[in-house]
Interface confidence: low
């Protein structure tokens, strides 16, 4: 038994490391966010016992704007981004985060992913200038691949909306 | 409708480099975590490398580590993937995706792109 995709949380990203019974997973507040004091960040993948389903417990979490991040300004979205060198999951946790509980999501995991249910439309709650969203969902099957093909799904924005396993990610730049 | 188109790939040397880009439309490039994936002949999905909006998370699987770059230009809705020191086992159909991806789970993304890599 697995759980599906987790939810999403506004400003807020998760790269989940395993969809097992138990797993227990931290949501990271974006760059220029911080975890409002008092909240959650975690959730852990339980069984309804009553259902035989399992799903993902609800975090509290709410990401603030850090003030103390303010002065900062985001690259444009223009820039080419690229790195070589992963960073620490430490460099992703703004002030006011809370102790991890259990082993956070490394930058350096193999295999670590957030997801959305297939045939599920991907609807960003916010506009691009305001948050972002990160969505993947479980393996389908696909055409032969070519050298320079192409693959198409339906997308539609929402604003007020959004399916399980879609994460709105805000759009600053460092933390 | 998202649209995802890989290119770059082909045959290569051991030891060799290739860059993989993959042009996006249809959907709010800029927004969204993108991720490259592979999969070896008769092998499964494995994930390569993902990248978040801002490319302040940025993150590689253990069998790259040190010669695939990843990276973005939000301008151009396109993603890359800068593969160095090329070795037989990277041989495989690359795909780029929307999305941080754990192993075998992974969707949408493009219909992929063909590296070979063999002396």
């Known amino acids: 038994i697995t759980c599906p995709p987790p939810m999403s949380v506004e400003h807020a990203d998760i790269w989940v490391k395993s969809y097992s019974l138990y797993s227990r997973e931290r949501y990271i507040c974006n760059s220029g966010f911080k975890r409002k004091a008092g909240t959650s960040s975690l959730t852990e993948c339980v069984l309804n016992k009553a259902t035989n389903v399992a799903h993902w417990t609800t975090p509290s979490l709410k990401c603030i704007r850090d003030p103390a991040l303010v002065h900062q300004r985001p690259a444009p979205p223009s820039t080419v981004t690229t790195a070589g060198v992963t960073p620490q999951p430490e460099s992703l946790s703004p002030s006011g985060k809370e102790p991890a509980a259990s082993s956070p999501s490394s930058n350096n995991t193999a295999a670590t992913t957030a997801a959305i249910v297939p045939g599920s439309q991907l609807m960003p709650s916010k506009s691009p200038s305001t948050g972002t969203t990160e969505i993947s969902s479980h393996e389908s099957s696909h055409g032969t691949p070519s050298q320079t093909t192409a693959k198409n799904w339906e997308l539609t924005a929402s604003a007020s909306h959004q399916p399980p396993g879609v994460y709105p990610q805000g759009h600053s730049d460092t933390t | 409708e998202v649209q995802l188109v890989e290119s770059g790939g082909g045959l290569v040397q051991p030891g060799g480099s290739l860059r993989l880009s993959c042009a996006a439309s249809g959907f709010a490039f800029s927004s969204y975590v993108m991720s490259w994936v592979r999969q070896a002949p008769g092998k499964g999905l494995e994930w390569v490398s993902g990248i978040n909006t801002g490319g302040d998370d940025i993150r590689y699987a253990d069998s790259v580590k040190g010669r695939f770059t990843i990276g973005r230009d939000n301008a151009k809705n396109t993603l890359y993937l800068q593969m160095n020191s090329l070795k037989p086992e990277d041989t495989g159909v690359y795909y780029c995706?929307?999305?941080?991806?754990?192993?075998?789970?992974?969707?949408?993304r493009g219909q992929g792109t063909q590296v070979t890599v063999s002396s």
């Open positions: 995706g929307v999305g941080g991806v754990a192993v075998n789970a992974y969707d949408p």
